[in-house]
């Protein structure tokens, strides 16, 4: 039975040209995290494998940095980066947990962070 929950940074906004940290946290389970995949609308951004470390997709090498922790840092943001991001936690023995973050990249300097929320 999957008892865990994923807490994410929720709906967030950031300025064009700036950076943002995407963070997810798995709680309420003793399952072992074997890998975390980061996706943007079905496109792979990065993989953090517990044994083998990080892989940043070649398409994003120049703008994506691993961490902090299992999170991901997006740099040199453009308005095209607006959209949904997913952290996919592969765990044993529970299986897969998925968290969703919506990022809005704003032209102006009025970028505020949204509230945190949970996905069971």
């Amino acid at each position: 039975m999957m008892t865990g929950t994923i807490e994410t940074t929720g709906n967030i906004s950031a300025e064009k040209g700036g950076s943002i940290i995407l963070q997810c946290h798995l709680s309420s389970t003793t399952a072992q995290v074997t890998q975390v995949n980061w996706e943007q609308q079905d496109q792979l951004l990065a993989i953090c494998n517990a044994d083998l470390g990080w892989h940043i997709s070649p398409s994003f090498k120049d703008r994506v940095a691993p961490g902090p922790g299992l999170g991901l840092t997006l740099q040199s943001l453009t308005v095209n980066d607006t959209g949904e991001y997913f952290c996919i936690y592969h765990t044993y023995p529970d299986g897969t947990y998925t968290g969703r973050i919506f990022l809005e990249v704003l032209e102006s300097s009025v970028a505020e962070h949204g509230a945190r929320f949970q996905i069971p």
Partner: antibody
């Protein structure tokens, strides 16, 4: 011991499709990429595309994107490369290879299958 | 796409002599985060599958003799066989795995003079 074992040689008609398999053993299949490379007779190596089974992420060479499909079956640790609308110039040896593209090891295509000869002829 | 240009196309070297193969990429292969160049070298003997020799420009794959060495950074790379042996007769390919699509050089055929 890491091994990649490919399916046997194929003879196909122009316009048809071919599906080549690559069975992996000796490592955790989900953790590494499987890439496909072809080599026409007397020619060099050409990268077709790859798949990461631990998420089924695929990447294709634009040259083949409309005609190739790469899949993986984690239950059997087998990757597949299907090429459609075959023409004579697709006659080549098709190789699968394990890819290690982690930022801390990065060993590229470190293990290769034995190759599968696909002949396209009317 | 990153274009990989190898030179020479073929090379005839006496046994025990040095063989040098060059590979030039159309874009830098240096990844700033880990300061590694995503460049590999493969050896392919007649009738065989390619075999990984060197990755990250200069790291020898396990079991590869130390007469094989790689060097370079950015866009210019070299594979050196310090003392050619009969079993080294093969075609050698460089490959970039920095960005999609991964691309190979045209190959260099090494023969005994």
């Amino acid at each position: 011991e890491v091994q990649l074992v490919q399916s046997g040689a194929e003879v196909k008609k122009p316009g048809s499709s071919v599906k080549v398999s690559c069975k992996a053993s000796g490592y955790t299949f989900s953790n590494y990429w499987i890439g496909w490379v072809r080599q026409a007779p007397g020619q060099g190596l050409e990268w077709i595309g790859d798949i990461y089974p631990g998420g089924a992420y695929t990447n294709y060479n634009e040259k083949f994107k409309d005609r190739v499909t790469i899949t993986a079956d984690k239950s059997t640790s087998t990757a597949y490369m299907e090429l459609s609308s075959l023409r004579s110039e697709d006659t080549a040896v098709y190789y699968c290879a394990r890819g290690d593209y982690y930022d801390s090891s990065g060993r590229a295509m470190d293990y290769w299958g034995q190759g599968t000869l696909v002949t396209v002829s009317s | 796409d990153i274009v990989m240009t190898q030179s020479p196309d073929s090379l005839a070297v006496s046994l025990g002599e040095r063989a040098t193969i060059n590979c030039k990429s159309s874009q830098s292969l240096l990844y700033s985060r880990n300061q590694m160049n995503y460049l590999a070298w493969y050896q392919q003997k007649p009738g065989q599958s390619p075999k990984l020799l060197i990755y990250w420009t200069s790291t020898r794959e396990s079991g590869v003799p130390d007469r094989f060495s790689g060097s370079g950074s950015g866009t210019d790379f070299t594979l050196t066989i310090s003392s050619l042996q009969a079993e080294d007769v093969a075609v050698y390919y460089c490959q970039q795995y920095y960005s999609y699509p991964y691309t190979f050089g045209g190959g260099t055929k090494v023969e005994i003079k």
